[in-house]
């Protein structure tokens, strides 16, 4: 049966915790994304930026969760509106914004 | 350390308005909510709202409705409350309090764990 | 609005009593995640309020083992196990799983 959204959403939260907790050198090497506005449409847009970083173990895990969340199929070089224009930030800022922005969906109880 | 420091004591007339700020330090309020709660002399606590400082969401008591608007300022780490219309039942303290999440944690409280001194707010013709 | 009832509305007691305060809502407060947030807060004369409790029973950082938290539903408690003279003051029930978030009217421990 299919897990319902909190599972879901907790699930990805656990693991954005995990990659936080365990981060001994610079996640992904120092790799930098894409910023998004953390907004309608989140886990597509977060997706979005991830998938063009390659070869990072850390983040495969986050990258196949999020591909669940969004409804569309994304690949690498794609990106919505959702973009902030031309600003790129470390792979472990985007990960920290992204977990302070998923725990309050979840405390206020919005899960799709 | 964590700190929230809030404006100085007010005395507005029936009518009037006033915004009480809070000012804080130590954390990123973009990470929290900030919220007020009031407290009438000799009363209980009364929650009157709360802000999401990273997109400017409030949620407001019914009662408050209209009547009040929490702002956050994220450039100057500042929250406020306005409150219009004041009358007499308004004179109380005036508390602003964060609640924020824990990196090393999924569940997390989002208690209102630190609070300003509290601003007195008096409310006499 | 949910209603929050603590009783008793004032309470005195002697330094090493066991103490409780219950605190009843007006309906079930299990927020939608799951979790219920039921909150118990510390107030002296001209202080700010202080966390103890959150989520009906996990002790805030710092605060003495002496104070605990219990309780489900609509029904909670908190428990002071052997009363030292810094704990007479005012203690408020708390819930925040449904907007409006609501106060108990608070409950007065005074020396006997």
């Known amino acids: 049966s299919p897990v319902p959204p909190s599972t879901a959403l907790k699930e990805l939260i656990e693991e954005l915790v995990n990659i936080t907790q365990n981060q001994k050198a610079p996640l992904c090497n120092g790799s930098m994304v894409w910023s998004i506005n953390l907004t309608a449409g989140v886990y597509c847009a977060a997706l979005e930026s991830l998938i063009n970083v390659s070869g990072c173990s850390a983040i495969e895990k986050t990258q196949r969760m999020l591909n669940g969340f969004c409804p569309h199929k994304v690949s690498a070089g794609q990106f919505s509106s959702l973009r902030v224009r031309d600003t790129k930030i470390e792979v472990a800022q985007f990960v920290k914004d992204l977990l302070v922005h998923l725990k309050k969906l979840f405390r206020e109880g919005q899960f799709n | 350390q964590v700190q929230l420091v809030q404006s100085g004591a007010e005395v507005k007339k029936p009518g009037s308005s006033v915004k009480v700020s809070c000012k804080a330090s130590?954390?990123?309020?973009?990470?929290?909510?900030m919220h007020w709660v009031r407290q009438a002399p000799g009363q209980g606590l009364e929650w009157m709202g709360t802000i999401d400082p990273a997109n400017g969401n409030t949620k407001y008591v019914p009662k408050f409705q209209g009547r009040v608007t929490i702002t956050a300022d994220e450039s100057t780490s500042t929250a406020y409350m306005e409150l219009s219309s004041l009358r007499s039942e308004d004179t109380a303290v005036y508390y602003c309090?964060?609640?924020?999440?824990?990196?090393?944690?999924?569940?997390?409280?989002?208690?209102?764990?630190?609070w300003g001194q509290g601003t007195l707010v008096t409310v006499s013709s | 609005d949910i209603q929050m009832t603590q009783s008793p509305s004032s309470l005195s007691a002697s330094v090493g009593d066991r103490v409780t305060i219950t605190c009843r809502s007006s309906?079930?407060?299990?927020?939608?995640?799951?979790?219920?947030?039921l909150e118990w807060y510390q107030q002296k004369p001209g202080k700010a309020p202080k966390l103890l409790i959150y989520?009906?029973?996990d002790r805030f950082s710092g605060v003495p083992s002496r104070f605990s938290g219990s309780g489900s539903g609509t029904d909670f408690t908190l428990t002071i196990s052997s009363l030292q003279p810094e704990d007479f003051a005012t203690y408020y029930c708390?819930?925040?799983?449904?907007?409006?978030?609501?106060f108990g009217q608070g409950t007065k421990l005074e020396i006997k």
């Open positions: 708390f819930q925040g799983s449904h907007v409006p978030w609501t």
């Open positions: 309090a964060r609640s924020i999440y824990d990196d090393y944690h999924v569940d997390d409280y989002y208690a209102m764990d630190y």
């Open positions: 309906q079930n407060i299990v927020h939608i995640n799951g979790n219920t947030y």
């Open positions: 130590g954390f990123y309020i973009k990470d929290t909510y």
């Open positions: 989520k009906i029973s």
